[in-house]
Each structure stands twice: as C-alpha cells, then as structure tokens.
C-alpha cells in the first residue's frame, strides 16, 4: 500500500519560518502534489502549493518556496508573520496523486517538544498515514 510521509520543522534562525517536507512511498509516478494547512480537526484549511511534474509549481502566501526534492518528494518553506504565521497546532497536509492509481494524503504538525530557540532534529521521524 502506498504511503505518504510528512516532516514539519521550525527554523532556528527565523522563528516564523517553517519547512515542510513530504514524500511518497509507492511504485507509481507522481502526477500532482498538493500541500495544504489549517487548524486542528480540519478547521479553516487552505492550499499552500500545488506541484505538477510537467505544468510547474503554484504557491500562495505564506508559502515562499515550493520545490521538488526528488521525483517523489517535495519541500516547502513557509514565511509567516502576524495572522499568516503558523502556530504550534497548525496542521500541514500533503496529498500525492498518482494517476490513474489514486491519491494518498498524510498530515503532520510541529512536534510538541519543539523549542522555538532550537532547531528540530535533522531527521525527525516521519508521520505516516495510509488511508
């Protein structure tokens, strides 16, 4: 069964900057990736970025830089300030589509132990969900 992993990290140098990394563990080729965010339990969500292997990348504030890391993983830098700044209980979701096989989503948030003055571990445990 394909799976998606999500990592969320707060940057030590810029306290309002977050990095989201997502990847797809499966055999199919990726046709589209959508990154979204919102409050817990699905509240107030919206799309941050859409990455298409052929048509390119679209991103919306506060997303600053979305890019492909590999053919099956992406990263997104968020630069927040004020109302658009993510908080500790913000949920980030990545959904990978592999046409025509299907699509899979996983969500994650900043680890509760993250200290704003410290960077998260370099390789945090991925959060997996296969629906």
């Amino acid at each position: 069964t394909p799976e998606v992993w999500v990592q969320v990290r707060m940057e030590a140098t810029e306290l309002s900057s977050f990095t989201i990394r997502c990847g797809f563990l499966g055999s199919g080729s990726i046709s589209l990736v959508t990154v979204s965010w919102g409050g817990p339990n699905g509240a107030g969500g919206t799309t941050l970025a859409v990455l298409h292997p052929e048509r390119g990348i679209r991103q919306w504030a506060p997303a600053r830089q979305a890019r492909w890391e590999t053919q099956s993983s992406i990263s997104l830098i968020l630069e927040g300030s004020g109302a658009s700044s993510p908080c500790a209980n913000t949920t980030f979701c990545c959904k990978f589509a592999s046409f025509p096989e299907g699509s899979w989503e996983a969500c994650g948030s900043l680890p509760p132990s993250s200290d704003p003055g410290l960077s998260a571990p370099p390789t945090p445990a991925p959060i997996l969900r296969a629906d």
């Epitope: 699905g42 298409h52 048509r55 679209r58 699509s103």
Partner: nanobody, 127 residues
C-alpha cells in the same frame, strides 16, 4: 486512500433539474478546493465549476452560469452540483475532482491534472 464517489446522475428531460453529490473520504476535505468537470461523448474534458475550501468563493464556466450552483458541506465531506434548466448540451459524464484547474490553465485538461478524482456519473438530457 482518497475516495471521491459521485452520485445523482441520470436521464432528465430538457429544462429539468438534477443534483449531483460527491462523497469524499480518506483526506482532509475541508482543506482543499473542489471542482466539477465533465466530458461529453466524443469530447475532451471541460471545467464546469470550482468552490474554494471554505465555500467563500465559487466560479463557473460561462455556459452554466445562472443554471448550475456548486456547494459543499465540510461537516459531511460532501460536494454538490445543483443543475437546473438542463440542456441537451449538458449531456456528459460529470467528475468530482480535488483542485482548481485554473492553477495551470484550462487547455488540454485531463483528470491527471487534479489531486483526486472520482469515477464519474452520467447525466443525459434528452426528451
């Protein structure tokens, strides 16, 4: 795995009405923009309508403006398309999809340009 399951299609006379539903599961439905697209027999995929994640913004192709209404219920993880004053040219397979096709342009639209897609429901408008 994400699932989008459409229902509500069928045979209707010109001038009639239908309400399509799309039940979503396996993802955080309320975080995503959703759209309806359709494919008429022998034709390419055509965008019909899009609604943003909180239902605050909707858009329609010109040919259905004033006749079709897109809506969603995030508490039920369901997308709807109310179709009134149906015409023969509305005959098509209607697909529920995640995403807004305007992100990359409406040219040469394909289901692979969306984040999720359903199996489609057939709408036939004929007397």
């Amino acid at each position: 795995e994400v699932q989008l399951v459409e229902s509500g299609g069928g045979l209707v006379q010109p001038g009639g009405s239908l309400r399509l539903s799309c039940a979503a599961s396996g993802f955080t439905f309320s975080y995503y923009d959703m759209s309806w697209v359709r494919q008429a027999p022998g034709k390419g995929l055509e965008w019909v309508s899009t609604i943003n994640s909180n239902a605050g913004r909707t858009s329609y192709v010109d040919s259905v403006k004033g006749r079709f209404t897109i809506s969603r219920d995030n508490t039920k993880n369901t997308l709807y398309l109310q179709m009134n004053s149906l015409r023969a040219e509305d005959t098509a397979v209607y697909y529920c999809v995640e995403g807004d096709p305007h992100n990359f342009g409406l040219e040469s639209l394909s289901l692979r340009d969306f984040g999720s897609w359903g199996q489609g429901t057939m709408v036939t408008v004929s007397s």
